[in-house]
């Protein structure tokens, strides 16, 4: 049994780090493998993560890591019974993937303005709470070419756009994702999308 693709890990900088790897053949990850992780710090002990299957030869492990700070560094040991398959380390602050925003809502009752709001995925006491910026993706279900991204570089989890910038009388979907420049994070996953019917009064044209 060998590791084909070494574990790579990302942290949500709140409570979970997720590590994924591939074995050289079909593996029952939860029965055959264990990922041990230990904070390199005073009086720290190793904790055990039981991996789950992620495709035939793929494994994924969700490591519990709370109260993460920038100095934290973990050693990682991947075991198959008594055999050490791989040894590495992981610094959560250098591999941050924020949680996805939630509760995306489109408010269509504001005089020809669309107001999109969503929830910050972190509690106010988390370091990332005040450091997230967002990208909002809006697309038409009818026209694949009608696809746009709005960058929200301010902290407020909302976006206002004129309804007239979109076509009237058709359905649109929106989704949102987040990143944090301070830790040069990757983008979060997209939030679940929300759908609405775009309709607005065409301005009266005089001839």
């Amino acid at each position: 049994m060998k590791v084909l693709q070494e574990p790579t890990c990302v942290s949500d900088y709140m409570s979970i780090s997720t590590c994924e790897w591939k074995m050289n053949g079909p593996t029952n990850c939860s029965t055959e493998l264990r990922l041990l992780y230990q904070l390199v710090f005073l009086l720290s002990e190793a904790h055990t993560c039981i991996p789950e299957n992620n495709g035939g030869a793929g494994c994924v492990c969700h490591l519990l890591m709370d109260d993460v700070v920038s100095a934290d560094n973990y050693t990682l040991d991947l075991w198959a019974g008594q055999q050490l398959l791989w040894k590495g380390s992981f610094k959560p602050s250098e591999h941050v993937k924020p949680r996805a925003p939630g509760n995306l809502t489109v408010h269509t009752n504001v005089s020809d303005t669309l107001l999109l709001t969503w929830s910050n995925p972190y509690p106010p006491d988390n370091y990332l709470y005040n450091h997230l910026t967002y990208a909002v993706n809006i697309w038409s279900e009818n026209d694949p070419a009608d696809f746009r991204i709005y960058n929200v570089t301010y902290l407020e989890p909302s976006l206002r756009i004129a309804a007239s910038t979109l076509k009237s009388g058709i359905s649109y979907r929106a989704r949102v994702r987040a990143w944090a420049q301070c830790y040069n994070t990757t983008w979060s996953e997209w939030s679940p999308s929300t759908k609405w019917h775009n309709s607005y009064r065409e301005p009266f044209e005089q001839h």
Epitope: L39, F41, L42, L43, S44, E45, H47, L64, M65, D66, D67, V68, V69, A71, D72
Partner: antibody
Framework: EVQLLESGGGLVQPGGSLRLSCAAS????????MSWVRQAPGKGLEWVST????????NYADSVKGRFTISRDNVKNTLYLQMNSLRAEDTAVYYC????????????WGQGTLVTVSS | DIQMTQSPSSLSASVGDRVTITCQAS??????LNWYQQKPGKAPKLLIY???RLHSGVPSRFSGSGSGTDYTLTISSLQPEDFATYFC?????????FGGGTKVEIK
Amino acid sequence: EVQLLESGGGLVQPGGSLRLSCAASGFTFSRYAMSWVRQAPGKGLEWVSTISSGGSYTNYADSVKGRFTISRDNVKNTLYLQMNSLRAEDTAVYYCARATARATEFAYWGQGTLVTVSS
Amino acid sequence: DIQMTQSPSSLSASVGDRVTITCQASQDISNYLNWYQQKPGKAPKLLIYYTSRLHSGVPSRFSGSGSGTDYTLTISSLQPEDFATYFCQQGNTLPLTFGGGTKVEIK
């Protein structure tokens, strides 16, 4: 909700022994280092001892080394402090505290139990 | 052992005041500096860990800063419930050590 409840304090004569307990609930006890911190009447805080999450590592303040023993039972979710050869200067409120991910930060504290060493 | 020197040992302030408490370590503690609040007859509560990280549920008027040997706790606008004693603690080296405390009293 994290809860820590100390017990076992009381009046003891110099040279005597006492065993403190701290019952933990509201979190996965076996994941966190635990500590004892004490406070003499009208004084500041003094760290006494810390034990790692699985009990493999312990450390003590010089003032109690060789006299006090910290231990834990991860099945019963309980932290202990065995105090022997007690001295008048050990008189204090003893708090048990749960760590953050790092053993040296005291995230949650019990209400404390008073130990009085006097003849 | 690392000595933690806290100052002032006491201060008087009014509601709404900005309050600053300092803590100096006898050697570099690599940002492993924690702040606790204690009210009479009660257990201490963690406010800030690792110099500037707010513990869960702590109001944002509390903030921490510093590096190396010098650290600061700031209360941006003192509230009635903030009158208490504050302790710093280094978590970089065993044995763990606390500052002597700063009592914040009503002016």
